[in-house]
């Protein structure tokens, strides 16, 4: 396997933020966009946003959907635009399924 | 119950190489980082770096980069160090640690793997 | 790379006291610290993660506060398993640093 070298400055990306932790912003910068989709007393809480931190997006990003919750992540300016995450539905696995895209 | 049990402690010969295992049980790495840590005697911790076990990416601090090599196997679920043309300086205990959510820092760590360079 | 300065090298108390140390950042990281309890012979331990936050099973008198280039931890009502050293580190930015710790002596 290849060692990737350390990276000065690592390529920063543009995302849409979408939810509260985006305050007034409607845009973020960071390493990776994500969308998410999870329940919370029994609401649909989306969210867009960015990791600003790489290690928190690839810990992030390798979490598998469960019922409650589902992250799907990008690298690639705008890239989340148009990602809408979605649950697993009723009766499906998703083994080794890989909630990533490039851009 | 989260464990990471390390290999013996190492006594090596100045310019050789040795390589030091971290043996998870509790849970599986490749739901996690696997990072590696120096710490030499009466000072201070260095993070090594971390492997992604699930894909093989590894991701160094730049003083370690041509020293240490991460590596895993995630059928044993086993992460290795690595340390390549050992000095003095090599000589510390280095301590593997898991990296998960939701804290994002190390949560779990090793016992730590002595190792003592001398001729 | 992220400097960490951690203040004191080191400090004496008493059981009962309350002590706070602190760490600066070389450059703003949020509140992507942790900090670390390490007794001698013994491998690190997470107390705080996040800067403010409550690793499991960590007792309430351990605290953290701060965001940006400062922050401090407190441990309040100091007890006689609690004399070890200290370290802060930062997880916002590789290589991940640490501050150069602090030994909690008994006075």
């Known amino acids: 396997m290849e060692d990737e070298k350390p990276k000065v400055n690592p390529k920063l990306y543009m995302c849409v933020c979408e939810g509260l932790s985006c305050g007034n912003e409607d845009h973020c910068e960071g390493q990776q966009c994500f969308s998410s989709l999870s329940i919370n007393d029994g609401f649909h809480v989306y969210q867009k946003g960015c990791f600003q931190v790489y290690e928190q997006g690839k810990m992030t990003c390798k979490t598998p959907p469960s019922p409650g919750q589902a992250v799907e992540c990008c690298q690639g300016d705008w890239c989340n635009r148009n990602i809408t995450a979605q649950l697993p539905t009723k009766g499906k696995s998703f083994p080794g399924t890989q909630n990533f895209h490039l851009e | 119950e989260v464990q990471l049990q390390q290999s013996g402690a190492e006594l090596v010969r100045p310019g050789a190489s040795v390589r030091l295992s971290c043996t998870a049980s509790?849970?599986?790495?490749?739901?996690?980082?696997m990072h590696w840590v120096k710490q030499r005697p009466e000072q201070g911790l260095e993070w090594i770096g971390w492997?992604?076990?699930?894909?093989?990416?590894?991701k160094y601090a730049p003083n370690f980069q041509s020293k240490a090599t991460i590596t895993a196997v995630t059928s044993s679920n086993t992460a290795y160090l690595q340390l390549s043309s050992l000095t003095s300086e090599d000589s510390a205990i280095y301590y593997c640690?898991?990296?998960?959510?939701?804290?994002?820092?190390?949560?779990?760590w090793g016992q730590g793997t002595s190792v003592t360079v001398s001729s | 790379d992220i400097q960490m300065t951690q203040s004191p090298a080191s400090q004496s108390a008493s059981l009962g006291e309350s002590v706070t140390f602190t760490c600066l950042a070389s450059q703003t990281i949020g509140t992507w610290l942790a900090w670390y309890q390490q007794k001698p012979g013994k491998s690190p331990q997470l107390l705080i993660y996040a800067a403010t936050s409550l690793a499991d099973g960590v007792p309430s008198r351990f605290s953290g506060s701060g965001s940006g280039t400062k922050f401090s931890f407190k441990i309040s009502s100091l007890q006689a398993e609690d004399f070890a050293s200290y370290y802060c580190q930062q997880v916002y930015s590789t290589p991940w640093t640490f501050g150069g710790g602090t030994k909690l002596e008994i006075k």
């Open positions: 509790g849970f599986n790495i490749k739901d996690s980082l």
């Open positions: 492997i992604d076990p699930e894909d093989g990416e590894t």
């Open positions: 640690a898991r990296y998960t959510s939701p804290y994002y820092t190390m949560d779990y």
